[in-house]
């Protein structure tokens, strides 16, 4: 069993989560989860759904009778989201922390809109990588 | 040139973000981008960049002389990151708007950490798309 | 003939909180930002916060984002500025501006400026 289970089952107990009555009004993020197949619509929706952990564990920092549980439920979200990778984890914290009021940022971000907006779709590649995908396919259709 | 990019233009000119200065001390965003090549990484990084660009225009919904730029580019965002698709953009907001505050969503979010946890590694798929794969595979060895 | 009044300072241990209000006069607001600006002893004028009169569409300088909040009253024509969290490095004149742009960090781009009300941080 992951180390996970035992340390969420102690914060249901803390929360007082593990009532029947918590299940009213549908799920946050199961049924969201159940929608999408495809990995990179997981990725897209599970990205959201583990910032939202992080801040809400964020909030809790100072109850100490939760930390262990916490660290350990954070380390094993590490290993499972991240694949205990420290920059992906570190590019991540650094995304999910800029301030939208920080007039900084603002300018930065808007400076960067034209860019940003011409690597969101997938077919958004660079031309290397383009190629290397071409050659995959090309690989594919002649075995 | 996809309608974004005037009305990006247009926004750089409202925040004066076409400075030199606004390049300083780094980027927020691109820098980030570059490190990551695996498309299911991208969109860990462009979840949270889509969702950081709809609340800084969130913040600045009341200025009117944006407004027309600020709504085409939330459309061509929507076109490029979601496929045009209501539904992953509705579940994108709904995931996004969830209060880390609110005691009833902080009781859901830990009634759900388990179920969530398991789902989080590519590998954790349901029984039936393991098969798949594994039939997948099998016919690709026997090619 | 536009005025702003700027009102709310003080002396404070560090770590307190203060008011700071503009109230507006001599024409319609609602189209525009109004900002904060500081000075302190022997240093330039800096932006701090700004927001348009309508509400919303804030920012705020690097230094006081998530101390310092700016909000407007458009019935008063007031803007105010709450400060917590205040540190001794907050100590300057702060002024109340109707920028000429509507997002502006430069203070030789303002219109308008309040008189100045001082705010000391003390340690």
């Known amino acids: 069993q992951d180390p996970y289970v035992k340390e969420a089952e102690n914060l249901k107990k803390y929360f007082n989560a593990g009532h029947s009555d918590v299940a009213d009004n549908g799920t946050l993020f199961l049924g969201i989860l159940k929608n999408w197949k495809e990995e990179s619509d997981r990725k897209i929706m599970q990205s959201q759904i583990v910032s939202f952990y992080f801040k809400l564990f964020k909030n809790f920092k100072d109850d100490q009778s939760i930390q262990k549980s916490v660290e350990t439920i954070k380390e094993d979200m590490n290993v499972k989201f991240f694949n205990s990778n420290k920059k992906k984890r570190d590019d991540f914290e650094k995304l999910t922390n800029y301030s939208v009021t920080d007039l900084n940022v603002q300018r930065k971000a808007i400076h960067e809109l034209i860019q940003v907006m011409a690597e969101l779709s997938p077919a958004a590649k660079t031309g290397k990588r383009k190629r290397s995908q071409m050659l995959f396919r090309g690989r594919r259709a002649s075995q | 040139q996809d309608p974004y990019v005037k009305e990006a233009e247009n926004l750089k000119k409202y925040f004066n973000a076409g400075h030199s200065d606004v390049a300083d001390n780094g980027t927020l965003f691109l820098g980030i981008l570059k490190n990551w090549k695996e498309e299911s990484d991208r969109k860990i990084m462009q979840s949270q960049i889509v969702s950081f660009y709809f609340k800084l225009f969130k913040n600045f919904k009341d200025d009117q002389s944006i407004q027309k730029s600020v709504e085409t580019i939330k459309e061509d965002m929507n076109v490029k990151f979601f496929n045009s698709n209501k539904k992953k953009r509705d579940d994108f907001e709904k995931l996004t708007n969830y209060s880390v505050t609110d005691l009833n969503v902080q009781r859901k979010a830990i009634h759900e950490l388990i179920q969530v946890m398991a789902e989080l590694s590519p590998a954790a798929k349901t029984g039936k798309r393991k098969r798949s794969q594994m039939l997948f595979r099998g016919r690709r060895a026997s090619q | 003939q536009v005025q702003l009044q700027d009102s709310g300072g003080g002396t404070v241990q560090a770590g307190g909180s203060l008011r700071l209000s503009c109230a507006a006069s001599?024409?319609?607001?609602?189209?525009?930002?109004v900002g904060w600006f500081r000075q302190a002893p022997g240093k330039e004028r800096e932006f701090v916060a700004r927001?348009?009169?309508?509400?919303?569409?804030?920012s705020y300088a690097n230094s006081v984002d998530g101390r310092f909040t700016v909000s407007t009253d458009n019935a008063k024509n007031t803007v105010y500025l709450q400060m917590n969290s205040l540190k001794p490095e907050d100590t300057a004149i702060y002024y109340c501006?109707?920028?000429?742009?509507?997002?502006?960090?430069?203070?030789?781009?303002?219109?308008?400026w309040g008189q100045g009300t001082q705010v000391t941080v003390s340690s």
């Open positions: 501006a109707l920028p000429s742009n509507i997002i502006t960090t430069d203070y030789l781009r303002v219109y308008y």
């Open positions: 001599g024409r319609t607001f609602s189209n525009y930002a």
């Open positions: 927001i348009k009169w309508s509400g919303g569409s804030r």
